[in-house]
Interface confidence: medium
């Protein structure tokens, strides 16, 4: 379907790109000596960029430094140093810069105070970093500024003495609504959800912390939860790791109503050692990966049903280390139900798998075309490619990005990988697939920084390397072609490449330094590709293109989680701009029922390579840990349940008789009858 | 504690060599350039030469030019100047210094080494 | 290169007046790039402003920093026994590195 990358030549040579470039180039100095650059994007479509320099010299019993803020309204083309709006205040780089939800335009930057100060010191910003207004905190904030999502005025933070500190009036005044508070965080319709210690603290009341829920910015309370030892949200499920009575084990509850009722999740408990993770989720369902017994580095991934109650076995195995908490889990983002991840075999080598269909399947991901099998292969001509992500770079491995997809680049991946048995410690390559993870080739060789503008439009690129750059690469068809541009005569240490969220933007900044004996110069590079992609792509640039599509005789051929979809995509040899306003144009059609589209309730199982669900064997001599909303039910069950998100109409009803399974409630976490209310007076 | 030491100064007759260490404790040696100062008895401060911390990027001053060669060894945390063709008015107090961040000015001075050339 | 000329070369107060000394560049220096060291006979410089502006750690607050361009200034608000040494002026922007002649500050 494609060949094997190209640079320079062979290609489709784009005319008088160099000219074009160099005059879209713009160059900026950052006059200060900081030793370390932080960047953050203000708003959508905005061009406002703030960076944070700061320049640090730690010491035994303080530190020391200054800060310089520097602001772009043009997207990284040229800075203004706006440090005096910051009345040239040391800003804490460990906060960072707290900026507001949407296109608010809120930015707060936390400061350094001296020792004996009675709290903290801010500076917000509404207007998109134009102004900032100092503000002296009643407090001594412990983490980051948290926004409301529903509100940008309303903000949280937690204190080094753990009170929980809510505005309604973005900062300006503070008032403490709750001590003893471990972790806080925001639900939806502006409810703050927290854990407080009854006794001692945090750390020692861990699996005896209190769960509680305010709706109204802390005037009210209702204790939703005992004997926590965590909480989390995930799409519409809110979740909690609860203490078993017995022993010292822990248990996840579901609840979909705020924490008003709570199911018990059909999942194994976890020891003291062990832990839960939540993968991904979304409004339907919830990826769970449950820890295994012992410091073994893997798990077991669960996909829910859209209670978040009834889970299925996904994979064995699931790479997720105890100690760094590294998992190689990725959503791949340009294309619905396709995930990526790591397993570890049985002699501790690492293996990428992949699933189409939300967890329902998972399989190697496919060799490239010509590539050839590396050493750790058996059978050199039978192999895959592993994919590295998280754990890789953890490990200091030479892999400068995890992979990268977004969702108005459709079907686009972009990984470093090998091509084996399993994933290589010798230096990775980059490889693209155009299709969503089903077929691959070699993009670039060896470890690349990459990046994706206007929409899969253009794929820029920077060399990994110990050595000064002065290179960029860039694509306009997907990473076949290659052109290299030399963007700067004097070669700059690289630290990153930096684009606007959302890959929409025709704009990549280049960051790096200049060192020489003397000092370091802090610098960035911003190319605006524009005038590349001269003409707006118009109807003749795009081809229609069935998504999931692997046996295009079948007439099922696309069909995951019940519906297909055709996307209308930029053809490769087209160089158009796709252009800021370009929304993904998507057909679906419904696709009638099977088997596949559902799974097994409770109390029923799949046997291995069959499809359809059987009871379990009366799961005899014990009683079923059960309990859905607090208490004993009767549960009635055809045996299947669709798959969260699923669409299919018609086809195969799996209909049968309806069972009553009587179980007995096990759970004797929060009935009802146990919550109470409190009003903060 | 952040330490400079240098060592390897004494007598020496013009036209001869000498080399100079400087031995750095208490910081990440490798993530600073470093330099040598010199003083004259009596005199001012003038700077000799600097190293970054890769050894990349040299720099020298000009009445030292083409006779000083500087040089480090970061796995041993330590700073070098080798000194050929010494002349009377290369008598001084040398300093070697770290930076206070990867660039600027030098926050920390070792106590100096006496070098006297003299016939 | 970039010459710093200091004035005056001697200054000759007493103890809880204020001190200022000059350092005047040869050509434009960017203010990140300028700092002052104290000397004391027998004994290594220490370092007191960088940034043209900015205090060392634990240089007391009587001694300030300003200016930009050319034209740069230390201030000692009030001089303490202690103050009392040769200051230099240094300019780290381009290479050479290079620092001025030096101020004596000695009791009048």
């Known amino acids: 379907r494609r060949g094997a990358p190209a640079e320079d030549q062979d290609c489709g040579r784009l005319p008088d790109f160099i000219a074009k470039l160099t005059n879209n180039t713009h160059q900026h100095v950052f006059d200060d000596l900081s030793g370390s650059v932080s960047l953050s994007w203000v708003g959508d479509s905005t061009g406002v960029i703030l960076v944070l320099t700061t320049f640090q010299v730690p010491l035994v019993i303080v530190s020391f430094g200054q800060s310089k803020l520097y602001r772009s309204e043009d997207y990284g083309k040229n800075f203004k140093d706006i440090t005096n709006l910051i009345n040239n205040t040391f800003i804490r780089t460990e906060f960072g810069m707290a900026i507001g939800p949407e296109n608010s335009g809120k930015v707060i930057l936390t400061a350094e105070v001296s020792g004996g100060s009675r709290g903290g010191r801010v500076f917000r910003s509404s207007d998109f970093a134009k102004n900032f207004v100092q503000t002296d905190l009643p407090f001594h904030p412990l983490t980051q500024m948290m926004y409301s999502p529903q509100n940008s005025d309303y903000l949280l933070a937690l204190s080094t003495e753990n009170g929980l500190w809510v505005s309604k009036n973005f900062g300006e005044k503070w008032e403490e609504i709750h001590k003893a508070v471990c972790l806080a965080k925001w639900g939806p319709n502006n409810i703050i959800f927290f854990t407080t210690h009854v006794n001692g603290s945090c750390k020692a009341d861990l699996g005896a912390l209190e769960l509680w829920r305010t709706s109204d910015l802390g005037k009210t309370f209702k204790t939703i939860g005992v004997k926590i030892y965590s909480f989390g949200l995930g799409g519409r499920f809110l979740f909690a790791s609860v203490m078993a009575d017995k022993d010292t084990t822990r248990r996840i509850h579901v609840s979909t109503d705020q924490g008003d009722t709570w199911s018990m999740a059909q999942l194994p408990s976890v020891g003291q050692e062990q832990f839960y993770s939540i993968l991904a989720a979304n409004e339907d369902m919830v990826f769970m990966h449950v820890d295994e017994p012992g410091d073994t580095g893997f798990g077991t991934i669960f996909t829910s049903d859209d209670r978040g109650i009834v889970y299925s076995k996904s994979l064995d195995r699931h790479l997720y280390t105890t100690t760094g908490g590294e998992t190689d889990f990725t959503n791949v983002t340009s294309l619905r139900g396709v995930y990526i991840t790591s397993t570890l075999s049985e002699d501790n080598s690492i293996q990428s798998m992949i699933t189409f269909d939300q967890g329902g399947r998972w399989e190697h991901l496919r060799k490239p075309e010509n590539s050839k099998c590396d050493a750790t292969a058996k059978n050199k001509n039978e192999c895959s490619l592993h994919i590295h992500a998280s754990y890789s770079i953890s490990q200091k491995l030479n892999v400068p990005m995890a992979p990268l997809s977004e969702p108005n680049a459709v079907g686009i991946v972009i990984a470093h990988g090998s091509v084996g048995d399993a994933i290589s410690v010798m230096v990775p390559d980059v490889y693209i697939s155009d299709d969503g993870g089903y077929s691959w080739a070699k993009m670039l060789e060896g470890p690349h920084y990459y990046t994706i503008l206007d929409s899969g439009g253009i794929i820029v690129a920077i060399e990994h390397s110990n050595r000064p750059i002065n290179v960029i690469k860039f694509s306009t068809d997907e990473g076949q072609c290659w052109q290299s541009y030399v963007f700067t005569q004097e070669p700059i240490y690289f630290t990153g490449l930096a684009s606007e969220p959302g890959a929409r933007s025709m704009n990549i900044s280049i960051w790096g330094f200049t060192e020489s004996f003397i000092t370091r110069q802090w610098v960035s590079y911003t190319v605006d590709f524009k005038d590349i992609l001269e003409r707006n792509c118009e109807e003749d640039d795009y081809t229609t293109w069935l998504a999931h599509s692997t046996d295009p005789g079948d007439y099922k051929d696309g069909c995951i989680l019940g519906y297909k979809e055709q996307f209308l995509r930029l053809r490769k040899s087209s160089v158009c701009q796709n252009g800021r306003d370009y929304v993904v144009a998507k057909q679906p059609s419904v696709c009638p029922c099977s088997l596949e589209d559902f799974l097994c309730d409770f109390g029923y199982f799949r046997p291995e390579n069959a499809s359809e669900c059987v009871e379990q064997p009366e799961l005899k001599g014990h009683e079923l840990e059960f309990c859905l909303y607090g208490k004993e039910e009767h549960l009635t069950t055809n045996g299947y349940r669709k798959i969260p998100g699923d669409k299919c109409q018609g086809g195969m009803n799996p209909a049968r008789e309806v069972k009553d399974l009587k179980k007995k409630c096990t759970s004797n976490f929060l009935n009802p009858t146990k919550q109470n209310s409190k009003s903060n007076s | 504690e952040v330490q400079l030491v240098e060592s390897g100064g004494g007598l020496v007759q013009p036209g001869r060599s000498l080399r100079l260490s400087c031995a750095a404790s208490?910081?990440?040696?490798?993530?600073?350039?470093m330099h040598w100062v010199r003083q004259a008895p009596g005199k001012g401060l003038e700077w000799v030469s600097g190293?970054?911390?890769?050894?990349?990027?040299?720099g020298y001053a000009d009445s030292v030019k083409g006779r000083f060669t500087i040089s480090r060894d970061n796995a041993k945390n330590s700073l070098y100047l080798q000194m050929n063709s010494l002349r009377a008015e290369d008598t001084a107090l040398y300093y070697c210094?770290?930076?206070?961040?990867?660039?600027?000015?030098?926050?920390?001075w070792g106590q100096g080494t006496m070098v006297t050339v003299s016939s | 290169e970039i010459v710093l000329t200091q004035s005056p070369g001697t200054l000759s107060l007493s103890p809880g007046e204020r001190a200022t000394l000059s350092c005047r560049a040869s050509?434009?220096?960017?203010?990140?790039?300028l700092a002052w060291y104290q000397q004391k006979p027998g004994q290594a410089p220490r370092l007191l402003i960088y940034?043209?502006?900015s205090r060392a750690t634990g240089i007391p607050d009587r001694f300030s920093g300003s200016g930009s361009g050319t034209d740069f200034t230390l201030t000692i608000s009030r001089l303490e026994p202690e103050d009392f040494a040769v200051y230099y002026c240094?300019?780290?922007?381009?290479?050479?590195?290079?620092f001025g002649g030096g101020t004596k500050v000695e009791i009048k």
């Open positions: 210094a770290k930076p206070l961040y990867r660039g600027g000015p030098f926050d920390i």
């Open positions: 208490g910081f990440t040696f490798g993530d600073y350039a």
């Open positions: 190293i970054s911390w890769n050894s990349g990027s040299i």
């Open positions: 050509q434009s220096v960017s203010s990140s790039y």
């Open positions: 940034g043209a502006s």
């Open positions: 240094q300019q780290v922007a381009v290479s050479p590195i290079t």
